[in-house]
Interface confidence: medium
């Protein structure tokens, strides 16, 4: 049914879905705090622009009786139930913030006639790509794939002189929501990553992974996995690893590698860590003081979602344009706005762009060092350390196939 939007006459409301099933196990109170901090900033910005309007948020809570797994497995129906709740109450804001689970976002997008923008902190899966009114404020799987293909093909750097065309992917089904969809994208036979690689095999058992580490008949020297160093240690332990194995550890939402007192454990020496360039520490943040790095990113995405709405509202009001139109719903893309701790760029499809950082462990200092950065917006790699102190022979990344000469 057609739901009237509380979105005119100088009063603009944001509907925030507070779902029990979430991409990250974050107390809803922290997300509320992030939203409220965002609202304060938006009100200030609108006032500074001479726009005397009211902006509020309505938090829509799930009853939690049926959908109580806490993770994303039972989120599909929860999202639709919340939309039904909004519909029954005849109370929809100008914009919908949430959900974060790929399943629920996909289903909500599919099952509703969306004439309003949807902003998500999550929805990492490929099934949420290219959605006309969906904006994603945490790096989706597509961005990861494009980095990996770009890096695999690179062969003109002092530390990487071989193109790669093969990989193992370790995926055992216990991953966090972000990792699940990142690895799912790499596994999918029709994905860009699979299309560009000549050989790719998914390892699903711990033993399969462990055997590959010293298997002379392995088909690739490169293994991609997703999680933190502790996750890798649980799996790998102190097992011997062949000298030309390269493990790519995808750990995007983790700032710990950049902390001063962090020393890389010995088991990380064969590992390249892919993470995101951390947030701007120059701005003290009241909402994130007590959050872990991952949770900070999640709460920050909620806050930035509010700031994005404020940015678009300001533009439309200054131009005298109507907010409850398809034009507004489709406008949340191909732009840069003032985020909480710096500029946030959205691509043509409303997905956040970011700087990814590839780290290695220095054999000299046992510290994580930056090997290269990658700008997802321009699909471009910037080499940083031209003489890395690698564990690999000649301080160069090995070929992906043992015994194959230069190409």
């Amino acid at each position: 049914s057609q739901v009237s939007q509380n979105c005119h006459n100088g009063s603009y409301e944001i509907s925030v879905l507070m779902m029990g099933n979430s991409a990250f196990a974050e107390p809803l109170k922290n997300l509320e705090d992030a939203v409220n901090e965002g609202l304060e900033i938006v009100r200030g910005r609108l006032q500074n622009a001479g726009l005397n309007v009211t902006v509020n948020a309505t938090f829509m809570y799930s009853d939690g009786l049926i959908h109580n797994s806490g993770d994303c497995r039972s989120s599909t129906c929860e999202g639709l139930d919340l939309l039904r709740k909004i519909s029954n109450a005849q109370r929809m804001g100008c914009v919908l913030i949430g959900p974060s689970c790929t399943y629920s976002t996909f289903q909500m997008y599919l099952d509703t006639e969306l004439s309003y923008p949807m902003i998500s902190a999550g929805s990492f899966g490929l099934s949420c790509d290219y959605k006309e009114t969906l904006t994603r404020l945490m790096s989706p799987a597509r961005k990861l794939m494009y980095f990996l293909v770009n890096f695999w093909k690179t062969n003109d750097l002092p530390f990487k002189t071989y193109s790669w065309s093969t990989s193992y992917v370790y995926k055992n089904g216990t991953e966090t929501e972000d990792c699940f969809w990142y690895l799912n994208a790499l596994e999918a036979s029709v994905s860009y990553f699979s299309h560009e690689l000549g050989f790719k095999v998914v390892l699903r058992q711990d033993k399969e992974f462990q055997d590959i580490l010293m298997d002379h008949n392995r088909k690739s020297n490169v293994i991609i996995m997703c999680g933190g160093p502790e996750f890798l240690y649980k799996l790998k332990g102190d097992r011997a690893v062949a000298e030309d194995i390269v493990i790519i550890l995808v750990d995007l939402f983790n700032d710990q590698y950049f902390e001063d007192n962090v020393t890389a454990p010995d088991y990380m020496k064969n590992v390249l860590v892919l993470t995101l360039s951390p947030g701007n520490s120059l701005l003290n943040s009241s909402f994130s003081r007590n959050l872990s790095p991952t949770k900070r990113d999640f709460a920050l995405a909620y806050l930035n979602g509010i700031l994005l709405f404020g940015h678009m509202l300001k533009i439309f009001l200054e131009n005298g344009e109507n907010i409850t139109t398809p034009k507004f719903a489709h406008a949340f893309r191909n732009l840069t706005f003032e985020g909480y701790d710096g500029p946030v760029t959205l691509d043509d499809w409303g997905d956040v762009d970011s700087t990814m950082v590839l780290l290695y462990t220095s054999v000299d200092t046992k510290k994580y060092k930056v090997l290269l950065t990658y700008d997802t917006h321009v699909n471009k790699t910037y080499p940083v350390d031209m003489s890395p102190t690698f564990t690999w022979k000649n301080s160069k990344l090995p070929n992906d196939i043992t015994g194959r000469g230069p190409q």
Partner: nanobody, 115 residues
Framework: AVQLVESGGGMVQPGGSLRLSCAAS????????MTWVRQAPGKGAEWVSA????????YYTDSVKGRFTISRDNAKNTLYLQMNSLKPADTAKYYC????????RGQGTQVTVSS
């Protein structure tokens, strides 16, 4: 040791120009996106401008667009902020910084715009 040292601030009349510099040492400067942040007396810090690690993408807060230009020279480990058409509202202490938590900002350089 990691260091960021800002310079180039001063007192200038409205409509005047200044060029701020930020010399970085002790870390791989070319690896990181860099930002300029400012703080006016009694106010919170606000970011002014940012530039990506390669130097080919720049951003500005609305109030300085068209007046300020951020740039970097990775060979010299230096970040710049060219400020034109300065206004009294630009009066603040300006800090450069990376987006990496362990690299604390420098001492800052004071910019005062007054007639």
């Amino acid at each position: 040791a990691v260091q960021l040292v800002e310079s180039g601030g001063g007192m200038v009349q409205p409509g005047g120009s200044l060029r701020l510099s930020c010399a970085a040492s002790g870390f791989t400067f070319g690896a990181y996106d860099m930002t300029w942040v400012r703080q006016a007396p009694g106010k919170g810090a606000e970011w002014v401008s940012a530039i990506n690690s390669g130097g080919d993408r720049t951003y500005y807060t609305d109030s300085v667009k068209g007046r300020f230009t951020i740039s970097r020279d990775n060979a010299k480990n230096t970040l710049y902020l060219q400020m034109n058409s300065l206004k009294p509202a630009d009066t603040a202490k300006y800090y450069c910084g990376t987006k990496i938590p362990q690299f604390l900002r420098g001492q800052g350089t004071q910019v005062t715009v007054s007639s």
